[in-house]
Interface confidence: low
């Protein structure tokens, strides 16, 4: 008879999760010479150890510390790009601007991007049927705690001018409840970070409003200024042109505003 299994509201662990994590680790360490020393089996063991056999609503940041330690990586000053609710464009940008990095361009973020995982208390099994949903079940689930942990670390290690890409099409351009608003903003270190520059990405081609005047952006400015970090904001009216100009900065059309 099949053993009773806890039913959660969220989708289950991504199929071939162990193989995917290992394969991504292999690919990442081959492409990034500075991470050549990483033993992918140890990375997987540490990842697994964070959630296997543990009640999936009682995961802590401490559970992920062995993994965080193995995946330690530094980003050069002025090269950190945070994002909120606009992941695809942020990733397209760093794929072109290869010297800037989002969390998903780092080993640990790359391993887990778009994956779901959870285990079960007191068994060595991975639960492929269902995993806890952040809202409906619990916030201390394996996936949410992972992203909170690595996002905190990513923000803590940032230095110089930090950039953040924000989605100007959303009702809350800056959302205090997003990972950026609840974790990263509060873990930027004022002694290392001189400024945060927000890039507000416009959605409609005819949208010429100054979204840097949006109340939520003013709220972000207030939070950042209180932490003794300077704040700048830039409207990106034409994201398609913005990317094109990152690729070809000498293009004559790129000398005008974007």
């Amino acid at each position: 008879l099949p053993r009773w299994r806890q039913q959660w509201s969220g989708s289950g662990t991504t199929s071939r999760f162990p193989e995917t994590v290992l394969a991504r680790c292999v690919k990442y360490t081959e492409v990034h010479p500075e991470m050549r020393h990483v033993d992918c089996q140890s990375v997987w063991d540490a990842f697994k150890g964070a959630f296997i056999s543990k009640y999936p609503c009682n995961i802590t940041e401490e559970d992920y510390q062995p993994l965080v330690k193995l995946g330690t990586q530094t980003v050069p000053c002025n090269k950190t790009l945070l994002w909120s609710r606009i992941k695809d464009l942020a990733h397209q940008f760093t794929q072109v601007q290869r010297d800037m990095f989002t969390l998903e361009d780092m080993l640990l973020g790359y391993l887990a991007d778009d994956l779901t995982w959870c285990g079960e208390f007191n068994t060595f099994e991975i639960n492929y049927q269902s995993c806890p949903d952040w809202r409906k079940d619990c916030s201390n689930n394996p996936v949410s705690v992972f992203w909170k942990t690595v996002s905190r670390r990513f923000a803590e290690t940032a230095c110089g001018v930090v950039h953040v890409m924000l989605n100007g099409s959303r009702s809350k351009i800056f959302d205090k409840n997003s990972t950026f608003g609840s974790v990263e903003v509060h873990n930027l270190q004022p002694e290392k970070v001189q400024a945060l520059e927000a890039w507000v990405i416009h959605g409609g081609r005819e949208d010429s409003r100054d979204l840097c005047q949006d109340p939520t952006i003013k709220e972000l400015e207030s939070i950042i200024s209180k932490r003794n970090i300077r704040f700048f904001c830039k409207n990106i009216y034409r994201p398609d042109k913005f990317l094109q100009c990152v690729k070809n900065p000498e293009d004559s059309s790129c000398l005008s505003g974007i």
């Epitope: 290992l22 394969a23 292999v26 990483v38 992918c40 089996q41």
Partner: antibody
Framework: EVQLLESGGGLVQPGGSLRLSCAAS????????MSWVRQAPGKGLEWVSD????????HYVDSVKGQFTISRDNSKNTLYLQMNSLRAEDTAVYYC????????????????WGQGTLVTVSS | QSVLTQPPSASGTPGQRVTISCSGS????????VSWYQQLPGTAPKLLIY???QRPSGVPDRFSGSKSGTSASLAISGLRSEDEADYYC???????????FGGGTKVEIK
Amino acid sequence: EVQLLESGGGLVQPGGSLRLSCAASGFTFDDYGMSWVRQAPGKGLEWVSDISWNGGKTHYVDSVKGQFTISRDNSKNTLYLQMNSLRAEDTAVYYCARGSLFHDSSGFYFGHWGQGTLVTVSS
Amino acid sequence: QSVLTQPPSASGTPGQRVTISCSGSSSNIGDNYVSWYQQLPGTAPKLLIYRDSQRPSGVPDRFSGSKSGTSASLAISGLRSEDEADYYCQSYDSSLSGSVFGGGTKVEIK
């Protein structure tokens, strides 16, 4: 089920060329490094060459450097070994072997093997 | 001449324990993991042990691997007639930038 099927072996004269192929199925081919390992009649195993998941890194045993070329076509799930200037001492069964998911050398092992293809170099 | 050194043969009676040694150097076994393969007559090799002592699923726990310094060993306990085969150790050699095998050990059942 993981399957590796070698082909392209046969009888060739000294100085001749052969191209071995290894068709892979049952796994995500471009997740893995791949290798060629050979075994001369009545002798032990000898690693010949390996290639990383994307073809970006290749390595060869000293005795075949400049003579053999390993390559892969991930769109066709196929591994190749181009063998030139063949000598009698290259006579062997050539096995295609799937590497581990690790690129890091310390963890490299051969998890699955094909049945091999016999290469005979003789006049 | 193989980079890793194994005894050419080993034997035992059914039920006995047989140990095969594999000796290398700091650039291979000393620094890297060891794997073991079984090759039954007329067949392709099969992975028995990886990462020094890990068994792939389906390999009986009669087979065990260990490593100390620049030497490794494979132990077969409760020897059975189907264990009659050639056994090879393998490691990566950092100085050669490639994999290396032992010369193989033929295990015979007396």
